[in-house]
């Protein structure tokens, strides 16, 4: 039985041409985590291997800087970068976490960020 | 120049261990995951497991686990890999490949060990 | 364990033909798949990464596709060189595993 939730920044926004870390955190469970993937949409952006360390995808090497943690820095924002981005959490035993998190990148300098919410 | 150098052709009898081992040059070895494939004669490829140097951290396909270990020495540039309780069917090409920067796959590989388990 | 399913097995052709192989995965495997080319007695050399990225010193005839569950390699026209064993890895989670292999052979 799966027990864990996932925390994670919720809805996030940020300023072009700034950066943002997208985090989650897995808790309520026993389980390993034995990999997080970070994913948009179809595209994978970097995966983080309990014990292989990073692998960053070729078309996001510039702009993606591993950590901290199990996040992920994603700098030099553009308005594509506006999105859902997912934490996929490999977990043994338990299976597969997914957390959501949706960003903003906006225009202006305001740029407000969300609450924190939880995904059962 | 990178180069991935391994070490000889080894013959051994069912139930024995080999170990195997991959000398690099031309890269900081720390810096890159090292990777270990093996091919049976005339099969496909088939990953053994991957390991960090810089902090030890080991990946086993559970095919493997608990009879390959991996282990490397940071002072001269080697990585190793031992299997145990060989049996026939072990009987292969081994191989040791560098991961790519900051990525799984493997750019260079090391020009492959012939285990013959034959009793 | 994720399953790699290579077709064709074998595949006859001349010099100058444009050649396909492809690679289904048993599960999505976003674009974290690499091509591999392996000719006998020697060890195999990294062509494609991340499912489209040609690998330093690779030619330019060589390009690969693909994202989720169906990637192909393609060699627009094929050289007397490129006659070898191809292969197919995923490395989106551990165990990697490779396709069974495609070999390519002069007509």
């Known amino acids: 039985m799966m027990t864990g939730t996932i925390e994670t920044t919720g809805n996030i926004s940020a300023e072009k041409g700034g950066s943002i870390i997208l985090q989650c955190h897995l808790s309520s469970t026993t389980a390993q985590v034995t990999q997080v993937n970070w994913e948009q949409q179809d595209q994978l952006l970097a995966i983080c291997n309990a014990d292989l360390g990073w692998h960053i995808s070729p078309s996001f090497k510039d702009r993606v800087a591993p950590g901290p943690g199990l996040g992920l820095t994603l700098q030099s924002l553009t308005v594509n970068d506006t999105g859902e981005y997912f934490c996929i959490y490999h977990t043994y035993p338990d299976g597969t976490y997914t957390g959501r998190i949706f960003l903003e990148v906006l225009e202006s300098s305001v740029a407000e960020h969300g609450a924190r919410f939880q995904i059962p | 120049e990178v180069q991935l150098v391994q070490s000889g052709a080894e013959v051994k009898k069912p139930g024995a261990s080999v170990k195997i081992s991959c000398k690099v040059s031309g890269y900081t070895f720390t810096e890159f995951t090292m990777h270990w494939v093996r091919q049976a004669p005339g099969k496909g490829l088939e990953w053994i497991g991957g390991l960090k140097p810089d902090n030890g951290g080991i990946s086993y396909n559970q095919k493997f686990k608990g009879r390959a270990t991996l282990t490397v020495d940071t002072s001269t540039s080697t990585a190793y890999m031992e299997l145990s309780s060989l049996r026939s069917e072990d009987t292969a090409v081994y191989y040791c490949?560098?991961?790519?920067?900051?990525?799984?796959?493997?750019?260079?590989w090391g020009q492959g060990t012939l285990v013959t388990v034959s009793s | 364990d994720i399953q790699l399913t290579q077709s064709p097995s074998s595949l006859s052709a001349s010099v100058g033909d444009r050649v396909t192989i492809t690679c289904k995965a048993s599960q999505d495997v976003k674009t974290a798949v690499a091509w591999y080319q392996q000719k006998p007695g020697k060890a195999p050399k990294l062509l494609i990464y991340s499912a489209s990225y040609r690998n330093t010193g690779v030619p330019s005839r060589f390009s690969g596709s693909g994202s989720g569950t169906d990637f192909t390699l393609t060699i627009s026209s094929l050289q007397p060189e490129d006659f070898a064993t191809y292969y197919c890895q995923q490395h989106y989670s551990t165990p990697f595993t490779f396709g069974q292999g495609t070999k390519l052979e002069i007509k």
């Open positions: 490949a560098r991961g790519a920067y900051y990525r799984y796959d493997a750019d260079y």
